[in-house]
């Protein structure tokens, strides 16, 4: 039932892509939470921000992240599709001046302070895989997405469209 | 150029069926969620359901589920909708509609079959 | 579900004229909202997603602007192609309902 991996055919095309606008065409604050419903929190430690990914007691307020959406353009060489090859990246900032940033040299993800323009490492291009669940591939390293390993956040390669649906890589966006 | 043709429309007597199909070309069918959208004559829109051709995940307007299905055959490009137990208050022009982004799904249906009637009457 | 509401259902305008459409979401749905135009016996046409982007190739007469519960379509200078009917809808978030048109037809 899976098509063409995504994640191989588009490898040069989104490396090349550009962000079409500087300025997000929309942003949504909502909390985050794993497939099988772990709430992702941030909590400042040391001056720094550490991310992790627990059961959150009842009643405990979830932390929120502001999702900025950008649209990106396909190389229409490579998109089949011409000028209509749009993909939606996203950055998220769980805080002021915070972003997640894809760390490729040791699979990890950080929180970085930074100033706009953003640097690459802190997009995202945004899958579907359900209608209810998104996952998030690094701009700067396709076919590795964000995912959870030993109750934190990863990067974590994948090779196939089959393993796009594997849980680890799947979250859930709560806007209440 | 993108290009989705709609057939399998006509004439159907009150709780019998119809299968939809949508012919999906000039684009990686793979990768775009694909939607049903109705109106009936006169009418206003109203959207049916959708469907990740490369995941099989789908999701519905909960007015349809359980006597309409949302399927997809990649090897066809094809989209398909099998409508079952079906009333006089389905009578509509059926179209497909793909949204504008790769892999994601927004609901905005930027490019739109020519749509197929389906007429319930007996 | 969240409901959209149209205002004119139907008006009469003149070539040259300044015309514009209101929609009113139920609730607060942000800026996820997108216009479309639908001419007799045709698809429609996607001219505005995301309340304010024209779509590629929409003529920049369209315009469209609001977020919350109240978004408006203003077309500057209607010319004789744009007699239609023109639709809101919310979208985004499951399921994505419609508002229920506008018609635009020659004074």
């Known amino acids: 039932a899976f098509g063409i991996s995504g994640v191989q055919k588009y490898t040069r095309a989104l490396h090349d892509s550009s962000i079409t606008g500087i300025s997000p065409i929309t942003e949504y604050l909502a909390s985050l939470s794993t497939y099988n419903d772990q709430s992702i929190t941030f909590a400042l430690e040391d001056e720094s921000y550490e991310i992790y990914v627990e059961d959150l007691k009842k009643d405990e307020k979830k932390d929120k992240v502001l999702l900025s959406y950008y649209e990106s353009q396909h190389p229409s060489n490579e998109s089949g599709d011409g000028v209509d090859g749009k993909m939606l990246m996203v950055t998220l900032s769980p805080t002021k001046d915070f972003w997640l940033h894809a760390n490729n040299k040791e699979h990890s993800v950080e929180l970085h302070k930074c100033e706009k323009p953003l640097p690459d490492q802190a997009f995202f291009v945004l899958h579907n895989m359900h209608s209810n669940c998104v996952s998030f591939e690094c701009k700067t390293d396709p076919g590795v997405f964000i995912g959870v390993k030993d109750n934190h956040l990863a990067l974590i390669k994948v090779d196939s469209s089959e393993n796009l649906c594997t849980e680890n890589i799947l979250f859930k966006l709560s806007e209440t | 150029e993108v290009q989705l043709v709609e057939s399998g429309g006509g004439l159907v007597q009150p709780g019998g069926s119809l299968r939809l199909s949508c012919a999906a070309s000039g684009f990686t069918f793979t990768d775009y969620w694909v939607s049903w959208v109705r109106q009936a004559p006169g009418k206003g829109l109203e959207w049916v359901a959708e469907i990740y051709p490369n995941s099989g995940a789908d999701n519905f307007n909960e007015n349809f589920k359980g006597r309409f299905t949302i399927s997809v055959d990649n090897a066809k490009n094809s989209l398909y909708l099998q409508m079952n137990s079906l009333r006089a208050e389905d009578t509509a022009v059926y179209y497909c509609a793909r949204g504008p982004y790769y892999y994601s799904t927004q609901i905005i249906f930027a490019y739109w079959g020519q749509g197929t009637l389906v007429t319930v009457s007996s | 579900d969240i409901q959209m509401t149209q205002s004119p259902s139907s008006l009469s305008a003149s070539v040259g004229d300044r015309v514009t459409i209101t929609c009113k979401a139920s609730q607060n749905v942000g800026n996820n909202l997108a216009w479309y135009q639908q001419k007799p016996g045709k698809a429609p046409k996607l001219l505005i997603y995301?309340?304010?982007n024209r779509y590629t190739g929409v003529p920049s007469r369209f315009s469209g602007s609001g977020s919350g519960t109240d978004f408006t379509l203003t077309i500057s200078s209607l010319q004789p192609e744009d007699f239609a009917t023109y639709y809101c809808q919310r979208i985004y978030n499951s399921p994505p309902t419609f508002g229920g048109g506008t018609k635009v037809e020659i004074k």
């Open positions: 995301y309340a304010s």
